[in-house]
């Protein structure tokens, strides 16, 4: 007897973190042999949506015209052959940015550090926020992601730096979000060039590097050292 | 007992619209998927599309795709179908139908029907 | 679209008969079809499903069998409420498409 049918691929263009509005399109892609493909949403009853297979069959396109809330969550999809259905693939966590306006990124004491020395990357919103994250350009996860204690409600979050090295240059933005749905995510900061100076290193990245699927020194969590930041906020590396 | 309950008979003139409501009570509506079909005098049945309640995804028929509009009001627990540029050929019983998603995606409950005559 | 042919349209038949239907799909519908029992001036019902699944309520005499293109609808002993219009109906893909309908009458 036949093992179980191998899981789909699930996946979203341009990507999984949407701006409020924007399209987005969902690819399941299965086999030649599959008659349906069934997309289902995390607490959603019914199937979320079914879609007939594309030529020549193998996947099958779920359309979102204009991002909204009720879009953002948790997604995966089945696909139907003549022998029954596949196992569910890997979830797909659909982001929505735009939710909340956005927060302020600032460095203290300034963005210009120089190399040895400590900075803090200061994310502060204007209403109060469980959730704040740290995202650095071309950086393939989120730095750091600060959730607070018991829910409490904070208007900024600290992430520290120490000591600086030519990796922690380049452009960054913070989100703020609340902990009741992390699928949706403020409108980004402004960016913030963090400049290093005092090392011989190009403290940017270059533009033609690829992220390389291992996880180098741009995908780590940036360990600040010293206490837990002051504002109260519990610290999670992604 | 799951019950659909369908809006009244319509008369329309060539070129209008028409808008036929179906009632889900019984179970969890937004639950299952929901079925639009119509049956012409006479004739057989036609499938038009169907919704889901849930989230308001739909699929329509492609013979219908730039006429016919579903939507859905979770909060009465109905399911509309709209259908616009009406002609003759349009006269028809129309039937709500609920999926029952599992082996066959097969119609397991339906509406009583709603007459929609079309005629100048 | 899959295309549904029931035969045949009509056909007359006497209590207590055994009476078969059958149903072709354009392509291989891998089981995906269903059978419907519609009386004049009334919404369809649901009979069987899944080809050979008979719907909560309906009386046993009534049974589906086939696989790929070719479906039956088999009645084993005619009731005098079972005359009536029976039609097939692919789930197997969108657009979901039904068979013309086979008239059972009284002979």
């Known amino acids: 007897q036949a093992g179980p049918l191998p899981k789909p691929t699930l996946w979203a263009e341009p990507g999984s973190v949407i701006s409020w509005g924007n399209s987005v399109t969902i690819w399941c892609q299965g086999t030649l042999e599959a008659r349906e493909y069934r997309l289902d949403k995390e607490e959603s009853p019914a199937p979320w949506d079914r879609q007939n297979p594309l030529e020549p069959k193998n996947k099958a396109r779920f359309s979102i015209p204009s991002m909204t809330e009720d879009y953002a969550g948790r997604y995966r999809c089945y696909y139907r052959s003549p022998v029954g259905w596949s196992q569910p693939s890997d979830p797909l966590e659909l982001v929505m940015t735009g939710a909340y306006s956005k927060p302020t990124l600032s460095a203290l004491p300034s963005p210009l550090v120089t190399s040895g020395k400590s900075v803090t990357l200061l994310c502060q919103s204007r209403s109060p926020m469980d959730t704040f994250l740290l995202i650095k350009e071309r950086a393939a996860h989120p730095l750091l992601h600060l959730r607070s204690e018991h829910g409490a409600q904070q208007h900024q979050a600290e992430f520290p730096m120490s000591p600086v090295t030519s990796v922690h240059g380049g452009t960054y933005r913070c989100f703020s979000s609340h902990g009741f749905s992390h699928y949706l995510l403020s409108h980004p900061s402004d960016p913030l060039e963090l400049i290093v100076s005092g090392s011989l290193e190009d403290p940017r990245p270059s533009p033609t590097r690829s992220v390389s699927t291992a996880a180098g020194p741009e995908d780590q969590p940036l360990m600040p050292t010293g206490s837990v930041p002051h504002s109260g906020l519990r610290r999670h590396w992604e | 007992q799951v019950q659909l309950v369908q809006s009244g008979a319509e008369v329309k003139k060539p070129g209008a619209s028409v808008k036929v409501s179906c009632k889900a009570s019984?179970?969890?509506?937004?639950?299952?998927?929901m079925h639009w079909v119509r049956q012409a005098p006479g004739q057989g049945l036609e499938w038009m599309g169907e919704i889901n309640p849930s989230n308001g995804r739909t699929n329509y028929n492609e013979k219908f795709k730039s006429r016919v509009t579903m939507t859905r009001d979770t909060s009465t627990s109905t399911v509309y179908m709209e259908l616009s540029s009406l002609r003759s050929e349009d006269t028809a019983v129309y039937y709500c139908?609920?999926?029952?998603?599992?082996?066959?995606?097969?119609?397991?409950?339906w509406g009583q029907g709603t007459t929609v005559t079309v005629s100048s | 679209d899959i295309q549904m042919t029931q035969s045949p349209s009509s056909l007359s038949a006497s209590v207590g008969d055994r009476v078969t239907i059958t149903c072709r799909a354009s392509q291989d519908i891998t089981n995906y079809l269903n059978w419907y029992q519609q009386k004049p001036g009334k919404a369809p019902k649901l009979l069987i499903y899944?080809?050979?699944r008979l719907h909560s309520g309906v009386p046993s005499r009534f049974s589906g069998s086939g696989s790929g293109t070719e479906y039956t609808l088999t009645i084993s002993s005619l009731q005098p409420d079972d005359f009536a219009t029976y039609y097939c109906?692919?789930?197997?893909?969108?657009?979901?498409?039904f068979g013309q309908g086979t008239r059972l009458e009284i002979k």
């Open positions: 109906q692919q789930g197997d893909t969108l657009p979901r498409t």
């Open positions: 139908a609920r999926d029952r998603y599992d082996e066959g995606n097969a119609m397991d409950y």
């Open positions: 899944y080809t050979s």
């Open positions: 019984g179970y969890t509506f937004t639950s299952y998927w």
